[in-house]
């Protein structure tokens, strides 16, 4: 797996760096996560047919992924900080049981998956420091988690492969939409 | 890194319009985010718009309404149409692309860039 933000190479051959701004160090954990999400698709796509179908019969799916809409305020038309960030950090929480079902569909990326997984917990709590409105966030709960995860599990192999694909897919569109709209604040 | 060639600009009356064209090579076009920036004599180099991955939009203030940024992932191409064009208007465009499809109002943000077009716009 890839060596987190601020722990490669770079950083440690310039001791004199100024220290990243939060803004920086969320725009750098996301793009740390985009390219861990990168190399899991390659596995996926080299696996099975699944990338080639089109974004119209992959619509067809009972997954209730996090996207971004209009009235989240994340994007130029009704654009709101406080709104879109709290809808990036509840979309992110609603991620992670998704997240913990790639943990055992990756063969030679398991720890890549891994990587991903703890990235996104990372960039939770950078998010939640820079929120002023913590209430408006609600967390996912741990019961319905647990049975939508058995649920996801027990799928034939086919179906797997798709979910697996889809929520790919999505969380990589859900964080470009969110660091496009982090980079507006 | 992709290589992007502008083309389309030259000059035009206020009110006017013009559409430029940036066609890139050498990557997986579908997956940037394109993005047009422009600099007039004088002045630092300034966002105009940009359209991610998913095909999300963001314009600056100054072309809001009166520029539309569009692509075709089939012929690797992004498109400025500029409609109602002013004398302030007038500068060399440049298209450019960020990799993580996610794009963004600064400079930094993008990793490959064109040689530019000039647009000039006469009152």
């Known amino acids: 797996a890839p060596v987190p933000p601020g722990e490669d190479s770079k950083d440690v051959a310039a001791p004199h760096r100024q220290p990243l701004t939060s803004s920086e160090r969320i725009d750098k954990q996301i793009r740390y996560i985009l390219d861990g999400i990168s190399a899991l698709r390659k596995e996926t796509c080299n696996k099975s047919n699944m990338c080639e179908s089109s974004k119209e019969a992959l619509a067809e799916n009972n997954l209730n992924l996090p996207k971004m809409a209009e009235k989240d305020g994340c994007f130029q038309s009704g654009f709101n900080e406080e709104t879109c960030l709290v809808k990036i950090i509840t979309g992110l929480l609603e991620f992670e049981v998704y997240l913990e079902y790639l943990q055992n569909r990756f063969e030679s990326s398991e720890e890549q998956a891994r990587a991903v997984q703890m990235s996104t917990k990372v960039l939770i709590q950078f998010l939640q420091k820079k929120a002023k409105n913590l209430d408006a966030i609600t967390t996912p709960d741990p019961t319905t988690n647990a049975s939508l995860l058995t649920k996801l599990q027990a799928q034939n192999q086919w179906l797997q492969d798709m979910t697996t694909h889809l929520i790919l897919r999505s969380f990589k569109e859900f964080l470009q939409s969110s660091l496009r709209a982090l980079r507006q604040m | 890194e992709v290589q992007l060639v502008e083309s389309g600009g030259g000059l035009v009356q206020a009110g006017g319009s013009l559409q430029l064209s940036c066609t890139a090579s050498g990557g997986t076009f579908s997956e940037y985010a394109m993005a047009w920036f422009r600099q007039a004599p004088g002045q630092e180099r300034e966002f105009v718009t940009d359209i991610g991955e998913s095909g999300g939009t963001w314009y600056a203030d100054s072309v809001k309404g009166r520029f539309t940024i569009s692509r075709d992932n089939a012929k690797n191409t992004v498109y400025l149409q500029m409609d109602s064009l002013r004398p302030e208007d007038t500068a060399v465009y440049y298209c450019?692309?960020?990799?993580?499809?996610?794009?963004?109002?600064?400079?930094?943000?993008?990793?490959?860039w064109g040689q530019g077009t000039q647009v000039t716009v006469s009152s």
């Open positions: 450019a692309a960020d990799s993580y499809g996610v794009g963004g109002g600064a400079e930094r943000y993008y990793d490959s």
